[in-house]
């Protein structure tokens, strides 16, 4: 090989030892039979030389340096070359390192040409392995300006004072040209402008100076990004932390066109504006650090641009200034990750502050849109608490667990309304009326309208789900002994035609000690599943629930259990059953945890089920299925 | 002085398959970098894949799950299978190996993916 740099290039060439590998034969330049392991080429030199091995790029580096010198003279602005050219040297991975310096006063872009440029976080690598390092400096100190990649949306960085490129090709790489210019500008006043270009829809991810250390102390840094005007942008920040600031504030700046609020001053941790019409500005602004713990600036976002959707120019008004005690929240439902790029899809408040989930909260009337290419990615979640403090003013009082309709009016399909009802302890308890009566969700009979109740204990020691329940059985309703949660639940998107069919009322009742009673109505010919509550993980321990159900004067009921013994074991005390006749009072008792299951019985009139658990051992829970068939007195039962 | 010859380039519908194979003479260059790039009509070069001395591979994003590099050390050969064809990847194929620091290239076979 021979490489001569003519002189006043300003080149410096360097031949060095790359990462060390576990190569057992070492490799050596060979000079006039001289082996050595790093060799330094200046501007009038010319050197020739061999290495002593097949492979050399597995153990050497080559760095070609262009320091360029705007200071004492004219700037050589234009497109910058490759030099010496790549033919020229050895198949090293190599590093074109340009490092300009100019005057404060003086501000230097660098153009990209296509393909633009990808930033990329601490641990990433590009796939083609070409990347761009590029680092300002603010008076003696290099500061990073970031690592990018090619196939991007970045196209030019401005910065004054000087600026260090390098470019690192691998040596398999055929790339023949820097790929960008030098031009001079005007003062930019901060440290760095950095301009993104979108095209079409896409995202970028960019990082403050510096990323993952801290940004410079009272710096200001600004990112240009040129959106088509048909074309949405959202900003939302992945990773920041806060410095200790002694004076000013650190925040982020929007300057967005046509927007009569500018600058729109943001700070790290509001969230950020989205649904942006066109181009727009955001800078990143320091403060002055606390001497003795400065901490560190750093942050690191990501600008999503996209179509958008019909939606969003629609408003929905949220009236809950009427409600109390009520959050309903939108938010992403939950999906296997794709690695394809996927449109954002977030929900706006006031059509500016755009989020991939939004919590709205009673007391007021929100304005939602929607930036969504597929507003089935969402869902509602709502949670509303009634609860009564006062035993004497509450008792007998109603309330009608509904949907309200603004509710059911979004075009966001609602996942679950939970209604959590409170009442003074050994005070009140409570009934659940439906307005149609309700079918026990089990395996025996599923349901399958377009929503279920979910009906559990609200007290955080108590682990008790009274079961899923839906319009069209025979329970009439369903009393409780204290704080509960009701969730409504939907299934399909027909529970926009099936809401008609929702509708339960809470009353407090007087205090009763048992934990739930059940009223089941059976209707003629149809079988009523029902089932303990907490099944498959058995009903707690020393806890009494009971069904009270109706026979009709003309019919007869038949009482069947699923299994021939209850596989309860108890640690403690005892588990039993006890069937009850109301007109006569008569009963029969069963030891739960000894006895076998009744078989079949017939019954005439209304009759209770009453069942209460021991402590039973780990594993040998009390679960316990059976069913209700009514038939016709007549029909002859032997 | 090594002289590199591509063959098995030719003709093939999208969604069809093609092994290139490169074969390496006038020294042994078995354990050492070797490369394919391509160059389509009016295109800048692009690299495409390479194998390195210690046989670790490495692809463009462009042919990544498509495209396997390989070597047989024994016969002095590089191959480059090629399955899920695109009409994009149509492009005269050259291989290149390193050797001593030098980058040596053949004259390139030409692939042509068209319905």
């Known amino acids: 090989f021979e490489i001569a740099l003519p002189r006043e290039s300003n080149i410096t060439v360097l031949i060095k030892l790359g990462t060390p590998t576990l190569l057992a034969k070492p490799c050596y330049i060979v000079i006039s039979k001289r082996h050595i392991t790093m060799l330094s080429i200046k501007s009038g030199e010319r050197i020739v030389f061999t290495f002593s091995c097949q492979s050399p790029e597995n153990h050497f580096v080559i760095e070609i340096q262009k320091n360029i010198d705007c200071m004492s003279g004219p700037c050589p602005f234009g497109e910058v070359q490759l030099q010496p050219s790549t033919s020229l040297l050895p198949t090293l991975n190599r590093t074109f390192i340009w490092d300009v310096k100019a005057h404060k006063s003086i501000g230097l872009e660098l153009q990209f040409s296509i393909p633009r440029l990808r930033q990329i976080g601490p641990g990433e690598s590009c796939p083609d392995g070409v990347t761009h390092s590029i680092s300002g400096r603010i008076d003696a100190t290099v500061v990073r300006i970031g690592t990018f990649c090619s196939n991007g949306t970045v196209s030019r960085i401005k910065m004054q004072e000087g600026v260090k490129m390098a470019l690192h090709l691998p040596w398999f790489h055929p790339r023949n040209v820097s790929g960008f210019s030098i031009a001079n500008r005007s003062s930019i006043k901060r440290l760095c402008i950095i301009e993104s270009v979108f095209e079409g829809e896409g995202s970028a991810t960019l990082m403050s100076a510096n990323y993952p250390e801290g940004f410079p102390e009272d710096e200001l840094m600004t990112w240009q990004f040129v959106v088509p005007a048909h074309l949405r942008a959202s900003v939302s920040f992945l990773n920041f932390n806060l410095s200790n600031c002694e004076r000013k504030e650190e925040r982020v700046e929007y300057y967005i066109p046509g927007s009569t609020t500018n600058p729109e001053v943001f700070k790290l941790e509001d969230k950020q504006p989205g649904n942006m019409a066109g181009n727009f500005n955001l800078s990143l602004q320091g403060c002055d650090q606390d001497a003795q713990s400065p901490g560190i600036l750093r942050l690191q976002f990501q600008v999503l641009v996209q179509h958008p959707q019909n939606e969003s120019n629609k408003i929905y008004v949220v009236d809950l200034s009427n409600e109390r005690a009520m959050s309903l929240t939108i938010e992403p439902r939950p999906v296997k990750q794709s690695r394809k790029f996927v449109p954002g899809c977030f929900v706006c408040l006031e059509s500016r502050t755009c989020s991939s989930n939004l919590t709205l909260t009673s007391g007021s009337k929100h304005k939602i849109s929607f930036l969504c290419d597929d507003l089935t990615r969402l869902w509602m979640n709502v949670e509303k608490t009634i609860s009564c403090t006062d035993h004497r003013y509450c008792q007998r009082k109603s309330y009608s667990l509904q949907v309200p309709s603004d509710i059911l009016h979004l075009p966001v399909e609602l996942h679950d309304f939970s209604w959590k009802l409170l009442v003074p302890k050994d005070r009140l308890s409570l009934v659940l009326v439906p307005a149609q009566k309700l079918q026990q969700h089990t395996h025996e009979k599923p349901c399958n309208t377009s929503f279920s109740y979910l009906v559990a204990s609200a007290i955080p020691s108590q682990d008790l789900y009274f079961g899923s329940f839906c319009p069209g059985g025979s329970i009439k309703q369903i009393q409780v002994k204290q704080n509960i949660s009701v969730t409504l639940r939907t299934f399909a998107p027909s529970f926009q035609q099936e809401a008609s069919r929702q509708g339960l009322t809470v009353s407090f009742i007087p205090y009763f000690k048992e934990e739930g009673v059940f009223t089941v109505t059976p209707d003629t010919k149809s079988k009523v599943y029902l089932r303990t509550p907490n099944w498959d993980r058995g009903l707690p321990s020393l806890t009494s629930v009971s069904w009270n159900i109706s026979v009709p004067r003309d019919q007869v009921a038949c009482l069947t259990f699923f299994k021939e013994r209850s596989g309860v074991v108890c640690q403690t005390g005892r588990a039993f059953m006890i069937i009850q006749e109301q007109r006569t009072r008569a009963e029969e008792i069963f030891s739960l945890d000894e006895d076998v299951l009744p078989k079949p019985s017939f019954h005439h009139h209304s009759f209770w089920v009453n069942i209460s658990n021991c402590s039973p051992t780990s594993g040998k829970q009390l679960d316990l299925l059976f069913s209700v068939t009514l038939t016709p007195r007549t029909v002859d039962l032997t | 002085e090594v002289q590199l010859v591509e063959s098995g380039g030719g003709l093939v519908q999208p969604g069809g398959s093609l092994r290139l194979s490169c074969a390496a003479s006038g020294s042994d260059v078995s354990a050492n970098g070797m490369v394919w790039h391509r160059q389509a009509p009016g295109k800048q070069r692009e690299w495409v894949a390479v194998i390195s001395s210690s046989g670790s591979t490495n692809y463009a994003d462009s042919v990544k799950g498509r495209f396997t590099i390989s070597r047989d050390s024994d016969k002095n050969t590089m191959y480059l299978q090629m399955n899920n064809l695109k009409p994009e990847d149509t492009a005269v194929y050259l291989c290149?190996?390193?050797?001593?620091?030098?980058?040596?290239w053949g004259k390139g076979t030409l692939v042509t993916v068209s319905s």
């Open positions: 290149g190996v390193a050797h001593y620091g030098q980058t040596y």
